[in-house]
Structures are given as C-alpha cells and as structure tokens.
C-alpha cells in the first residue's frame, strides 16, 4: 500500500502508474467501491457521482500519455483520510491518504519568552510521524504529532520550513512566526552623580498600529522595596504618560522607541528597573531590565572617597589615582578611599578588564576645598 501525506486545505496527488507507459483504461474508487473518476478508452475524464460531490477530485490528463493516472484531491479535508483504489490493467493499487491539520497555539504572533505548540491532527490512526521545522538561520526543532518551541526569542521570528515524515514519505509546509520583543533583554547605564540619564527601550519589530500600556518599576539599591516610577499608555504608536512619581521627576518621549529621561543621576536612584509592556490583544507582557550605576566622588574632611552604587559585576574594579601616580585600588568593588590626598587632579575609574565603564575627576585643593 502506497502512503501519501497531505495538509488540510491543500492538494494531494495519489499515484497510479501503468507498466506500459501509455494511455489505458483506469478507474479511481473509494474503498467502498464508489467510483470517483476514470478514463474508459476515449481519453475523456468521466466523474462518478454528482459534480458537486466530486468537484475537488481531478486527474492530470497531460500525464496519461506517459502511463501516469494520478488522482488529484484539492482543498483537502480531514475526512479525505482513507484508502483509495486505482484499478487498471486487471490489477488494483491501494493508496493510503493521510490528511493532517496543523494548529498553532496560542498562534504565530507571540511575545518574547512565550512558547508555541504546533499540533498535527488527523482522523486516521497513523503511527507517530516525525515533524521537523527549520528556521532560515539554521535553528531546528523536531517532534512528533506535537512540536514545542519554548522561550521564543525575537531572533526566532520569520519563516520556518517544516516537514512531516511518515514511512519515508514527506510533506512540506511553512509557518511565519512573529515574536514581539525588545531589542535587548537588559541594558546598563553608567553615570556620574548629577548627570542626566537616558533610558531607551527599542522594540525589535515594527507594526503599523501599536496599542498597549506599560510601567517602569524601580528597585533602588538603597531601598527596601521597589516603586513604580511611571505608567503610560501606547496608542497607535503615540506614548502618553498616565502617572509619574514626584521623585524622580521622569520625562518620557511621546514617540517610539520608548525613551525616558531622568534629570539627574543621584545615589538614591542607583539600582535596577523592569519596564513591562502589555500589548492589546496579546496575553502576557514584554519585559526589559534596565540598570543604573552611579559614581560619586567627594572629599570630606581629610578623605577623598570614590563610590559606585548600583548593580556592578564582581569583575569590575574601582580605582582612584592622581595623574602620573600609582592607582589606589578598591579592596571591595564599590568604594575606594584616600586619606590626606595630595593636591591636584584625581581620577576615579570603574573598569571591567581593559574597558573603562566610567570615570570622574575631582580637583583636590590644598585648602581642603574641592571642585569636580
């Protein structure tokens, strides 16, 4: 028995070949012997039943001369899954058609971090097929009647080429995924105390109309609990602020990409935030983490102190040095002090490996007065 795979709504071609490689009488039947169509010697396609009953069934007249008498079934339905019989040259050939339906749950437009389940449904009791989907960038996901793709990323967007294999027979279908998300999962901003801070949250997709709402929650390093800094609406790509804290007084751009400005980087603001964006007609939310590291350099009494606040990595080094002098390196990562500093220009550096993340300079005057 020959097996043919077909996807619901598409077409399938069931083969029937003559050994003589020439036109001959043939008949296609259902397994219950009802005639579908055939050719009875005059080169004319004869259909069985009423036209409306069999208008989805056809053959390739151009192939008959070569001894090929395929049965074409268009707009495949699940109930087309059955055995078909081709009668020619006093023999019967059975062809098994397996029609499957593909469902995507929750859909093919998803949010970053969500999962997609691809399910193959069929009426026939077939053994487990192999389903394999390949992204144009090379990523491959495989399964059987159920294929899962978890923790989707923006990079998973675009066209996927999928094949269903059963008994070495293959059927191809495509799916286009659209994974909505931010360009970066996380970002970090380094600022000297008093500097203006800009946070940007570019989206990794473009749509004509984008509607939803969002909020930035902030966990300051020095605070015991997080605080909502700003809430906003997004309508047709226009951003409107709903509520903003009095301290800090954030400003938000009214156009995409989402953009926030903090007038001053102050030690009490150092920490990390989580911007969430809920999009209309989508379950779940988009998230982007943002971190703020603030550097403070001050001379108090007879001690010069450089301190960083906010989420730094253990690989980072904090150094305080005077021009052309040896650096004083922090034993801990976040603070370095020099008692009785010499007069002149001092520089504090926060670095990771050979990369300077930020630096701040302070002029130490002999009178014990300083200026940054």
């Amino acid at each position: 028995k020959t097996l043919v795979l077909g996807k619901e709504g598409e077409s399938a071609e069931l083969p029937c070949e003559s050994s003589q490689k020439k036109i001959t009488v043939f008949t296609w039947k259902f397994s219950d012997q009802r005639k579908i169509l055939g050719q009875h010697g005059k080169g004319v396609l004869i259909r069985g039943g009423s036209p409306s009953q069999f208008d989805r069934f056809d053959s390739k007249k151009g192939a008959w001369e070569k001894g090929s008498f395929p049965l074409i079934i268009n707009k495949l339905k699940m109930e087309d899954s059955q055995t078909y019989i081709c009668e020619l040259e006093n023999r019967k050939e059975e062809v098994e058609l397996w029609v499957f339906k593909v469902t995507f749950s929750p859909g093919t437009s998803l949010l970053q971090g969500q999962s997609l389940t691809l399910t193959l449904d069929s009426n026939s009791k077939v053994s487990n097929p192999l389903t394999e989907c390949k992204h144009k960038k090379g990523k491959v996901v495989s399964g059987s009647k159920v294929l899962s793709m978890s923790n989707l990323r923006v990079q998973d967007s675009d066209f996927w080429n999928c094949t269903v294999t059963l008994d070495q027979k293959k059927n191809w279908f495509g799916m286009t995924l659209s994974v909505l998300g931010f360009q970066k999962a996380s970002s970090i901003v380094y600022k000297k105390e008093g500097e203006q801070v800009e946070f940007s949250f570019p989206l990794a997709f473009t749509v004509e109309k984008l509607t939803g709402s969002g909020e930035l929650w902030w966990q300051a390093e020095r605070a015991s609990s997080s605080k909502s800094w700003i809430t906003f609406d997004l309508k047709n790509k226009e951003v409107s602020v709903k509520r903003v804290t009095q301290d800090p007084k954030l400003q938000m751009g009214k156009k995409l990409p989402l953009h926030l400005t903090l007038p001053q980087a102050l030690p009490q603001y150092a920490g990390s935030g989580n911007l969430t964006l809920a999009l209309e007609a989508k379950t779940g939310k988009l998230h982007q983490e943002v971190n703020l590291v603030v550097m403070k350099v001050a001379q108090l009494n007879n001690t010069l102190t450089c301190e960083v606040m906010g989420p730094t990595s253990p690989k980072m080094r904090l150094t305080l040095k005077q021009e052309n002098q040896e650096a004083r390196v922090s034993e801990e990562q976040k603070v370095v002090q020099v008692v009785a500093p010499e007069t002149g220009l001092w520089q504090c550096l926060l670095s990771e490996g050979d990369k300077v993340k930020m630096d701040s300079r302070i002029q130490v005057l002999s009178r014990g007065v300083n200026q940054t």
């Epitope: 203006q196 309508k235 226009e238 751009g253 009214k254 953009h259 007038p263």
Partner: antibody, heavy 118, light 107 residues
C-alpha cells in the same frame, strides 16, 4: 493639496468666550493628530494644544489648561478650540496645524486673530 | 517643561553666505526636533523634522543635525527668500516647546 482654514477669531472682552474652527481638506483628517499654536503680537510661537488622531487624547499648555478645550469632528473634517475665561495675554494669531506620521506639525493654516480687550 | 534656547537671537548675513543657527534643549530629546521658518505677516512653514529630515519641497540648501541636547540648522548658501525668522521646536513630549526664534536679516 493639504489645506487648513481657521475661522472664529475676533474681538472679545476679558472673561469672555470664543470658539475657533479649522476646516481641513486634502488629507484623511481622522488619521492625523491636530494642534493649535499661537503667536502674540511681536512675540514667538507658543504651542497651545494637541488632539491625537481618532483616539482623541488631548494635551494642553499650562497657560490654557482648564480654560481651553480642543476637540475634533472627524465626520466634518474640522478641528475646534473652545476658549473660555479669556485674558488679555491670550491675544494672538491662532494657527491650526496638522501633524505628520512622525507627530511633527508639518502643515500650518494662515491663522485667525483673537483680540482680548475691554 | 523642556526649555529650548536658540542662538543667536538675530544675525545679519549676505546672499550666498553659509548660516548656522543652534538650538539647545534643557534635557535630552533624542532627535525629536523640528525647524520652521516664518516670514513677516505669514504663517510658519515647516522645514525639517526628526532633527535632519527635510520636509518635502524644502530646498536642499537647508540641513539639520544634532542629537540629545544640541541641534543645528544650516543654510549652505543664503538666498534672498531665506531672510526670515527661524524657530526650533522640541517634539519629545508635552508641552511642545519652541525656541525664542532667530531672525536672519540682510547685511
């Protein structure tokens, strides 16, 4: 051709009211944000108010908040500015403007003059 | 509100001169800035948006640049019809704010 034509200006006493209209043509009115900008005699430009497209979010300058109301009738392709409790400092030429897709005021009307004086 | 400071407030130049007007925002506004031109007794005309994008129909001698807080409008070769007052406008957020204007006069 995109055109904006303001009307409704005139002389009004302090404390009085006036309603400005702006008839728009040559573009799909409902899909663009619209604004009012004013210019006092011999002074620079001052943004007054904006109404977003068919969603209808409204924004006002602090100097007019609570006294002026911007509105639109998309079926009539018309923008309005209802001005109440008028003050001498509201004396200006009022321009109607259309925003482009990037929310910039790309087309301006010729303006209508409002004079608040006793 | 974001303050926009234009400089100079006025300048005298001759036809053919290269003219530069600057505009500074009191805080970072990305490239959300526009420039418009106004002639006496006329309505303003929009020239540039998104700091550097020329509005359709505006001559290429006009150009804009800048990002964050500092922006520039340049007229590469001043023409007789360019004598006017130029305003910058921040479109980062509400309230939208204009610079005080720069009057370009004939020397």
């Amino acid at each position: 051709e995109v055109q904006l034509l303001e009307s409704g200006g005139g002389l009004v006493q302090p404390g009085g009211s006036l309603r400005l209209s702006c008839a728009a043509s040559g573009f799909t009115f409902s899909t663009y944000a619209m604004s009012w900008v004013r210019q006092a005699p011999g002074k620079g430009l001052e943004w007054v108010s904006t109404i977003s497209d068919n969603i209808g979010n409204t924004y006002y300058a602090d100097s007019v908040k609570g006294r002026f109301t911007i509105s639109r009738d998309n079926s009539k392709n018309t923008l309005y500015l209802q001005m109440n409790s008028l003050r001498a400092e509201d004396t200006a030429v009022y321009y109607c403007t259309k925003d482009n897709e990037d929310y910039y005021m790309d087309v301006w009307g010729k303006g209508t003059t409002v004079t608040v004086s006793s | 509100a974001i303050q926009m400071t234009q400089s100079p407030s006025s300048l005298s130049a001759s036809v053919g001169d290269r003219v530069t007007i600057t505009c500074r925002a009191s805080q970072g506004i990305r490239n959300d800035l526009g420039w418009c031109q106004q002639k006496p007794g006329k309505a303003p005309k929009f020239l540039i948006y998104a700091a550097s994008t020329l509005q359709s129909g505006v001559p290429s001698r006009f150009s804009g640049s800048g990002y964050g807080t500092d922006f520039t409008l340049t007229i590469s070769s001043l023409q007789p019809e360019d004598f006017a007052t130029y305003y910058c406008l921040q479109d980062y957020n509400y309230p939208r704010t204009f610079g005080q204007g720069t009057k370009v006069e004939i020397k």
